[in-house]
Interface confidence: medium
């Protein structure tokens, strides 16, 4: 059985479309599971992995390796 584009698995009932945009940053493995691109995490691979050591409480990032501080916090790790 040959599955349609973006369909995977037995019965072709698993759907996965690789994407690299606001809504996700992932490839699809041979089973149709999402595999996050480097620097991204989460079930939809849309959460950037911040700079190592970035305070999870006072820092965040839109892009991998970044560390943006909340108002009132500063430093390389927003700590």
């Amino acid at each position: 059985v040959t599955c349609d584009d973006y369909y995977y698995g037995f019965g072709c009932n698993k759907f996965c479309r690789p994407r690299d945009d606001f809504f996700g940053h992932y490839a699809c493995d041979q089973n149709g599971n999402k595999t996050c691109m480097e620097g991204w995490m989460g079930p939809e691979c849309n959460r950037a992995i911040c700079r190592q050591g970035c305070s999870p409480k006072h820092g965040s990032c839109k892009l991998p390796g970044d560390c943006r501080c909340q108002y009132g916090w500063q430093g390389l790790y927003c700590d």
Partner: antibody, heavy 119, light 107 residues
Framework: QVQLVQSGAEVKKPGSSVKVSCKAS????????MHWVRQAPGQGLEWMGA????????AYAQKFQGRVTITADKSTSTAYMELSSLRSEDTAVYYC????????????WGQGTLVTVSS | DIQMTQSPSSLSASVGDRVTITCRAS??????LAWYQQKPGKAPKLLIY???TLADAVPSRFSGSGSGTDYTLTISSLQPEDFATYYC?????????FGGGTKLEIK
């Protein structure tokens, strides 16, 4: 279970702003973007934009660019949609909505917030 | 931006009828299409995603088909609770636009 609970109805004057909240529960708030969709009385559905609560990245429909601001507070698992320079055509029910676990469509919806713009 | 054209805009049918609603995208959306049902005063409810996959707890009388730019929602045998407004929506690229809706009324 996933729940999205929105703030109550608002009546606003033309030219003013409105800020609608959407409190999420039943999942990890930062794992999924939150979207906003509106529906004018008797009209269809209109996608306005979305936010990635983890990092704060946003995407907006061009129609609303510059007039809508979507934000998120990770500490309270709450998303906000602020619409400025209100006009009568902005009278609508505003919904927050979230995707399902392994697909893109909106499987989870808030109950809707009616915003009435009237002088 | 991809535009979604839904037809018909309204439809009268009877309980037991087979009903078809179509949605045409202005570009290839590669099956990234959903169908929703909405009743007055309620939020939309997801019926079908990825063009043909039934959402949880949706009755099997609902089915979706299509590819490329043309998609169809079929209700094989209308039940009283199916009278509502139906919307398609694409998820290929932002903005994720909806079709104009099809109001399904009792004949």
């Amino acid at each position: 279970q996933v729940q999205l609970v929105q703030s109550g109805a608002e009546v606003k004057k033309p030219g003013s702003s409105v800020k609608v909240s959407c409190k999420a529960s039943g999942y990890t708030f930062t794992d999924y973007e939150m979207h906003w969709v509106r529906q004018a009385p008797g009209q269809g559905l209109e996608w306005m934009g979305a936010i990635q609560p983890g990092g704060g990245g946003t995407a907006y429909a061009q129609k609303f660019q510059g007039r809508v601001t979507i934000t998120a507070d990770k500490s309270t698992s709450t998303a906000y949609m602020e619409l400025s320079s209100l006009r009568s055509e902005d009278t609508a029910v505003y919904y927050c909505t979230r995707r399902g676990y392994d697909d893109y469509p909106f499987a989870y919806w808030g109950q809707g917030t009616l915003v009435t713009v009237s002088s | 931006d991809i535009q979604m054209t839904q037809s018909p805009s309204s439809l009268s049918a009877s309980v037991g009828d087979r009903v078809t609603i179509t949605c045409r995208a202005s570009g290839n959306i590669h099956n990234y299409l959903a169908w929703y049902q909405q009743k007055p005063g309620k939020a939309p409810k997801l019926l079908i995603y990825n063009a043909k996959t039934l959402a949880d707890a949706v009755p099997s009388r609902f089915s979706g088909s299509g590819s490329g730019t043309d998609y169809t929602l079929t209700i094989s045998s209308l039940q009283p609770e199916d009278f509502a407004t139906y919307y398609c929506q694409h998820f290929w690229s932002a903005p994720w636009t909806f079709g104009g809706g099809t109001k399904l009324e009792i004949k």
